[in-house]
Amino acid sequence: MAVTACQGLGFVVSLIGIAGIIAATCMDQWSTQDLYNNPVTAVFNYQGLWRSCVRESSGFTECRGYFTLLGLPAMLQAVRALMIVGIVLGAIGLLVSIFALKCIRIGSMEDSAKANMTLTSGIMFIVSGLCAIAGVSVFANMLVTNFWMSTANMYTGMGGMVQTVQTRYTFGAALFVGWVAGGLTLIGGVMMCIACRGLAPEETNYKAVSYHASGHSVAYKPGGFKASTGFGSNTKNKKIYDGGARTEDEVQSYPSKHDYV
């Protein structure tokens, strides 16, 4: 029950996180005009990964896409790439995790397969979250660098009569959305990995086996692995040797003075 809850919660948290990463990537407010200590203008500038916008005081907003690919800063391209990789990995992770959910029964899928899928999706969520956090952090670092550079420029070369106002940019809402979303995806991924441990069969999960001396040869029964189907049933694999070793689950067990447990 706890495993199912952990897995389900991990899935939901990751889903919210990935939705947030997608939202952050699409948002225009990655950087917004810094209004502190600046002359009050009737125009507000903000920029995203894909376009820059200007909102006039009247409410009129004009956005222009970055139609060049080669002319854009390498850092911006890197951020775009990180966010897209994060979204793609997250989307694949979500797809995998749907099939891995313990509460969803798909054919005769074993717990070991579900465990592997849960682990795979968990790792994908972790990497997706890290990509988003890295992308947002790279952009934030770029903003901080540019902010102090433009601040330095503001206080130099003002000897003439004409003053030039340098537009400085600060953190936009998308950065915070991205950080939170990346964190949620990461947490969701960790939860999926934890859930995987509870789903995975133990390495030597054989029940107590009775051995008794038989003839000279022990014949191996063909079709040695029994795969148990059925939701919630014991899916532990049992190797069955005819006359040699039988599990306690087997009804016909003939104890004799040679038996050891």
Epitope: V40, N45, V54, S58, E62, V165
Partner: antibody
Framework: QVQLQESGPGLVKPSETLSLTCTVS????????VHWIRQPPGKGLEWIGV???????NYNSALMSRVTISVDTSKNQFSLKLSSVTAADTAVYYC????????????WGQGTMVTVSS | DVVMTQSPLSLPVTLGQPASISCKSS????????????LTWFQQRPGQSPRRLIY???TGESGVPDRFSGSGSGTDFTLKISRVEAEDVGVYYC?????????FGGGTKVEIK
Amino acid sequence: QVQLQESGPGLVKPSETLSLTCTVSGFSLTTYGVHWIRQPPGKGLEWIGVIWAGGSTNYNSALMSRVTISVDTSKNQFSLKLSSVTAADTAVYYCARAAYYGNGLDYWGQGTMVTVSS
Amino acid sequence: DVVMTQSPLSLPVTLGQPASISCKSSQTLLNSGNQKNYLTWFQQRPGQSPRRLIYWASTGESGVPDRFSGSGSGTDFTLKISRVEAEDVGVYYCQNAYFYPFTFGGGTKVEIK
């Protein structure tokens, strides 16, 4: 069509409060704001302030302590209040619609002459 | 506050001849975000209210004759009348529409010689 009409007392005593109303038609007050501008006799234009469609206001720093611009959407009216008036406030007062593009002023009222005298 | 300086104060012109009015601002009116200059030109005919001719420094208002054109960027702007007509007589103002408070230039009076 877009119309703006200023109204108010033509004569105000010094130290009193000047109250003007701008009645508008032909446009939505939720989309457009209004600027107030004045022009002393024989002189140039002086921007007083603006109230934007969202309700935010900006004023001329020289008049900020004395001026208030407000809107009454139910009456389709904008109002200007200027306190502690002196003879220097004698002017033609205009209201003008805040243009949607370029932060300009696209339609102007005819203006109303206000004289400050005892 | 941003200071808008217009020149000349008075501009006597001959009908059919071109006219040019200069406007300088103490701070740049160019917005880096959209590369637009927030400068507006107004015309005030004698006894009338002002009307907007040009916004964004060079975009003509609808209904304004195309003999009026605006140019310039940053701090230096110009209003040109390609061929002056009798109805162009009046005072022309430039306005800063970028920084609060919005400020007007002192005005340039265009009159026929």
